[in-house]
């Protein structure tokens, strides 16, 4: 599945400039190749878009319907989490049931927890409805215990 990377340039707290890049995320507009990096938290998120209907086009990434919906969802998540520690999203899947969206979000480890991922998404639902014409419901967020996501240790400065 095509993926979206938060491809902004950031500065670390030591002031060295780098591009956030986290496997398994890739991005065609990203100026450096993603490299393996530790200290990443992943969250699995699913939600319903109740004002859309699922059809076979959403099983084919080459269709306009698939690509437009994926673009809107990717843009929406970049708006919700902005850039501070948000590294991107991947593995967008569409399922029947109006439209059920499933995806994985990646964040710099230690910068957010599962409750705040869900809170911030829920806070944005009204804006999503007006900006993207997406009526969102049944939001569910859970931790993803990726083997290469390091254990949470001393906190990341905020």
């Amino acid at each position: 599945t095509p993926t979206t990377l938060a491809s902004h340039s950031t500065k670390t707290d030591a002031s060295s400039t780098h591009h956030s890049s986290v496997p398994p995320l890739t991005s065609s507009n990203h100026s450096t190749s993603p490299q393996l990096s530790t200290g990443v938290s992943f969250f699995f998120l699913s939600f319903h878009i109740s004002n859309l209907q699922f059809n076979s086009s959403l099983e084919d990434p080459s269709t306009d319907y698939y690509q437009e919906l994926q673009r809107d969802i990717s843009e929406m998540f970049l708006q919700i989490y902005k850039q501070g520690g948000f590294l991107g999203l991947s593995n967008i899947k569409f399922r029947p049931g109006s439209v059920v969206v499933q995806l994985t979000l990646a964040f710099r480890e230690g910068t957010i927890n599962v409750h705040d991922v869900e809170t911030q998404f829920n806070q944005y639902k009204t804006e999503a409805a007006s900006r993207y014409n997406l009526t969102i419901s049944d939001v569910s967020v859970s931790d993803v215990p990726f083997p290469f996501s390091a254990q949470s240790g001393a906190g990341v400065p905020g």
Partner: antibody, heavy 119, light 107 residues
Framework: QVQLVQSGAEVKKPGSSVKISCKTS????????MNWVKQRPGQGLEWIGQ????????NYNGKFKGRATLTADKSSSTAYMELSSLRSEATAVYFC????????????WGQGTLVTVSS | EILLTQSPDFQSVTPKEKVTFTCRAS??????IHWYQQKPNQSPKLLIK???ESISGVPSRFSGSGSGTDFTLTINSLESEDIATYYC?????????FGQGTKLEIK
Amino acid sequence: QVQLVQSGAEVKKPGSSVKISCKTSGYAFSNFWMNWVKQRPGQGLEWIGQIYPGDGDTNYNGKFKGRATLTADKSSSTAYMELSSLRSEATAVYFCARSYYRSAWFAYWGQGTLVTVSS
Amino acid sequence: EILLTQSPDFQSVTPKEKVTFTCRASQSIGTSIHWYQQKPNQSPKLLIKYASESISGVPSRFSGSGSGTDFTLTINSLESEDIATYYCQQSNNWPLTFGQGTKLEIK
């Protein structure tokens, strides 16, 4: 290292306005939310609102909407808060504080700016 | 708005004592609570994030626990430099809110 340096103390008349600044360094200013927090003398902390300098997106505590205006200048990596129609209750120390997201915690704080409203 | 109530408002303590602060939320907030220390005429300093996650540079005598509505900050063996006011803050809902604080005083 990350630094947030605020402008100096202000004394203002009731009904006037004040604009305080928070100059940042040591990180990518555009990519983090800047929050403002009020502390009245001898009192607790109160969140005023936040701005995302990358696109100017703002969120306010309803209690301060219309009285506080948050702006940011990316070219100078400086955040601003303007308080209007000042009343005596606005006498307080105001802090800027950086966060990763809209809803988050604050690891970096400015040193505070004391605003005194007095006739 | 989520109300955070800290107790007690004031606490008299002695060095080396184990000190516990509590913060109660008006509704369940998971683990979205953060603790700060503020000394007179200084900015708040982050001690613990997300109820129990340690912060680089903060002494290990500070620890946190809790979830849902009840949270605790513990200083394992109080040092004289820990005399300050302690605040909890929630990030589970807007507006972001703080507790009213607990002020430590030397007995």
